[in-house]
Interface confidence: low
């Protein structure tokens, strides 16, 4: 078989003999050097991902209940290309499992034992499955038979296709659970026309369920959406109050050596050719012998997945809760203190030691996890293995946008009502040497440049969104001679002043001697012309505060600032020349983990901040030489964000809007990622 | 909902006995963890015993170890705390406390009203 041949897996007759066709017509329209078509048929869809594992066959397409499968060990395949549904202009690639309710019910998420449930069909993913595996734990025991631990936790229900001898309760509310349209509750419009028939006070659902059975707005308005953190929002917003966002149809391929570029120039010019309207001979998206035969009747294209994504992004955190749950039937059995301990996210070696040292000093409140880079650790966050972390405003922006919420913030300024008032921000400045008489913001270009790291607030986000606005390009690696914004690509020129060695150099971590504020600043001291960092970093390195080797000798009057209106002015002028305002840098979490992770953070800040005098001989949470390990040196204390508490909320308009323009210049994976998601 | 309710507190001297018992009402299946919190005055609400519904885990604070034991009866929905050997610093308001399964969803700890505690010397 030639190197570029996909091997397509079909999983009955009708299958096969439309992948033959689908073969034939591809070689027919596209160059011999192109993609090509090979057909392997297998008896079952968990053939196919055996298959695929072990390299027999390359793809095949998906729903997410078997996306799930294909991620688990030992088949480890991803998600490479999406089946979209709706118009070009607005692809839906997923949609929304939700719990509606009737809006003078009164009750929330936390409250639904004893009440009557409709479901579209036993086994299906938003009327069952997603819902059951939520409320899993919840589930008297014992939990199996699980249709038992349900018929006992709802007071009544209707479950289509449930056993009504066994399970009577299922049955309730349709006797008999016939599992057709015959029964009139039966699917999506059947379990919401329970619902509103009064026979059942929650429906499980899809997003659309209510907007496709009512077509009137003063109707819908009747209707709810249950949120998971126990509050209601109305059913238009179902993208923030869901119980799992689920993909549609996804084609999967192998992790590693998986063709995933390959797969998607055969789908994209399949598309092109044979999408809808496109051929009368042959239709990707048709079936005449069958429903949904390789791909999707109802699909309209494909959209590439970014490669970023693994299968437990792509299907989040509360899908692949609730499938664990059911698949796995076990529940975690709570410590009996209030709060499970929180993971710290640590990256690389020097904030893992730091880590280490406040999980001893926490007893078991704190626990680690690492990673190399910012962007791992909210991967991890997103999918379960971390639950918190510090974060630059450029960061909680990507953060927001990956479903995490802001949950303190840090404060740097000492106030006796520091923990109450969240504070309004620090100045994001650009230092140069006093001795560079000549350089002003207007003359710039060519010089060589100093950033606490890509994506980061003060380093690259405000100088390099404010540069845009006058270059118009994204080519800052060709605007500045050189420099070192840590986390840009290995070959840039923004690479060449890093001083890491090996594969260290350039790396957006600690191992980078250039990363971050003390990083950017020696970057400055040692080989650059300007530094972007933040108002606090010059004094903070200066006048003896830095002990370090390259900074102990320096003097704060040997640097100045450059304002944005072409003057200079000294390093404590910063209120009057600066960049731009810059949020402070708060943790993050995910919202299920919200009220734990505020609770045990500021016990752990009572224990361990400000307030301990001694850092030589005791645990300081807010101290590491200048390293800014974790948190910020200079944090006085995690403060409460009061209603801010949604990364737009926290970030302000002003800054999204800014980090928005720039994301045309954006590197970053994992918010392509997640803007995929959701976007 | 779960419904927690105290009774058996009361005055005592030093080096007594009292056993607590704590009423579970409703929702009772959705519990994973029960057991007894005290506050005394001026002071932070700390655990003093707790153990999980199944019985594999038992935690007691190290200032009653030995002292206080927690059992309960499943049938009656009930925990005890027994408090044997007691000393004026265990002079508190106990609370009753049950902890929901934990499952995706966010909780919040059930609590009773509380009863006092008075050890005289």
């Known amino acids: 078989v030639p190197d570029k041949t996909v091997r397509w897996c079909a999983v009955s007759e009708h299958e096969a003999t439309k992948c033959q066709s689908f073969r034939d017509h591809m070689k027919s329209v596209i160059p011999s050097d192109g993609p090509s078509v090979a057909c392997v048929k297998k008896a079952s869809y968990l053939d196919c991902i055996r298959a695929i594992a072990a390299n027999e066959a390359d793809a095949v397409t998906l729903d997410a209940g078997l996306v799930y499968d294909a991620y688990l060990a030992p088949n480890n395949l991803k998600p490479v290309v999406a089946e979209f549904y709706g118009s070009k202009e607005d692809p839906q690639t997923f949609y929304y499992a939700v719990a509606v309710v009737k809006k003078d019910s009164g009750f929330q998420m936390n409250q639904l034992r004893g009440k009557k449930s409709c479901h579209t069909g036993l086994g299906r993913s938003a009327g069952w499955n997603i819902p059951i595996g939520l409320l899993y734990c919840d589930l008297p025991e014992p939990r199996k038979p699980l249709e038992k631990a349900v018929a006992n936790f709802f007071s009544g229900s209707c479950a289509p296709c449930a056993d009504g001898t066994d399970f009577p309760q299922l049955c309730q509310l349709c006797p008999g659970c016939g599992c057709s349209t015959l029964n009139q509750y039966f699917g999506y419009s059947g379990a919401f026309k329970c619902l509103k028939d009064g026979a059942g006070d929650v429906a499980f659902v899809k997003h659309s369920t209510i907007f496709e059975n009512l077509a009137n707005k003063a109707d819908r308005d009747q209707y709810e959406l249950l949120c998971l953190d126990n509050t209601r929002k109305p059913v238009d917003e179902y993208k923030d109050c869901h119980l799992a966002q689920v993909p549609s149809h996804t084609v999967v391929a192998r992790s590693m050596g998986g063709k995933e570029d390959l797969i998607w120039e055969l789908l994209n010019q399949a598309q092109e050719h044979f999408g809808k309207d496109k051929s009368k001979e042959f239709q990707l998206f048709s079936s005449p012998h069958g429903k949904d035969l390789l791909f999707k009747d109802s699909a309209h294209g494909f959209l590439k997945v970014p490669p970023r994504m693994d299968a437990k992004m792509y299907l989040g955190y509360e899908y692949v809760t609730a499938i664990r749950n059911l698949r796995e039937g076990t529940c975690p059995e709570a410590p009996t203190d209030e709060c499970k301990p929180v993971k710290w996210c640590a990256l690389s070696h020097h904030e893992r030691l730091k880590c280490d040292e406040w999980s001893v000093n926490s007893v078991g409140k704190i626990e680690c996890v690492s990673a190399e880079t910012t962007e791992d650790c909210i991967a991890k966050i997103m999918n379960g293995e971390a639950d918190a972390m510090s974060l630059d405003g450029g960061f909680v922006y990507i953060a927001g946008k990956c479903g995490l919420v802001p949950v303190l913030a840090e404060n740097y300024n000492k106030s006796d009502n520091c923990e109450d008032t969240p504070e309004a921000g620090y100045f994001a400045i650009a230092v140069v040497k006093k001795s560079a008489s000549d350089l002003t913001w207007d003359n710039l270009k060519g010089k060589k440049s100093c950033h606490t790291a890509v994506g980061r607030t003060a380093g690259w986000n405000i100088p390099m969104g404010l540069l845009y606005n006058k270059i118009n390009h994204c080519r800052f690696d060709e605007f500045f001679s050189e420099g070192c914004a840590p986390g840009s690509k290995k070959d840039s020129s923004l690479c060449k002043l890093c001083m890491g060695s090996g594969l260290n150099l350039c790396e957006p971590n600690n191992k980078e001697g250039y990363y971050g504020y003390t990083g950017a600043f020696r970057c400055l001291v040692e080989k650059g012309d300007v530094a972007f960092v933040k108002h606090q970093t010059v004094p903070q390195n200066t006048g003896g505060k830095n002990p370090d080797p390259w900074a102990k000798n320096l003097n704060e009057k040997d640097y100045e600032l450059l304002c944005l209106d072409g003057t200079r002015k000294p390093v404590e002028e910063y209120a009057n020349c600066h960049l731009a305002r810059a949020p402070n840098h708060a943790v993050v979490t995910r919202k299920d983990k919200e009220a734990c992770v505020h609770k045990i953070l500021r016990q752990q800040q009572h224990l361990f901040g400000s307030n301990v005098t001694d850092c030589s001989g005791n645990f300081c949470l807010f101290r590491s030489e200048t390293k800014d390990l974790l948190f910020r040196d200079d944090t006085v204390c995690l403060a409460k964000l009061h209603d801010r508490n949604t990364y737009e909320k926290y970030l302000g308009e002003e800054y999204v809007k800014a980090v928005g323009n720039l994301r045309k210049c954006s590197t970053s994976s994992l918010l392509e990622a997640c803007t995929f998601r959701r976007p | 909902q779960v419904k927690l309710e105290e009774s058996g507190g009361g005055l005592v001297q030093a080096g007594g006995s009292l056993r607590l018992s704590c009423v579970a009402s409703?929702?009772?299946?959705?519990?994973?963890?029960v057991g007894w919190y005290r506050q005394a005055p001026g002071k932070q609400r700390e655990l003093v015993a707790a153990t999980t519904t199944s019985g594999s885990s038992t935690n007691y604070a190290d200032s009653v170890k030995g002292r206080f034991t927690i059992s309960r009866d499943i049938a009656k929905n009930t925990v005890y705390l027994q408090m044997d050997s007691l000393k004026p610093e265990d002079t508190a308001v106990y609370y009753c406390?049950?902890?929901?399964?934990?499952?995706?969803?966010?909780?919040?700890?059930?609590w009773g009203q509380g009863t006092q505690v008075t050890v005289s010397s």
């Open positions: 409703g929702n009772v299946f959705g519990i994973d963890a």
């Open positions: 406390y049950a902890r929901p399964k934990q499952a995706t969803l966010i909780r919040d700890d059930y």
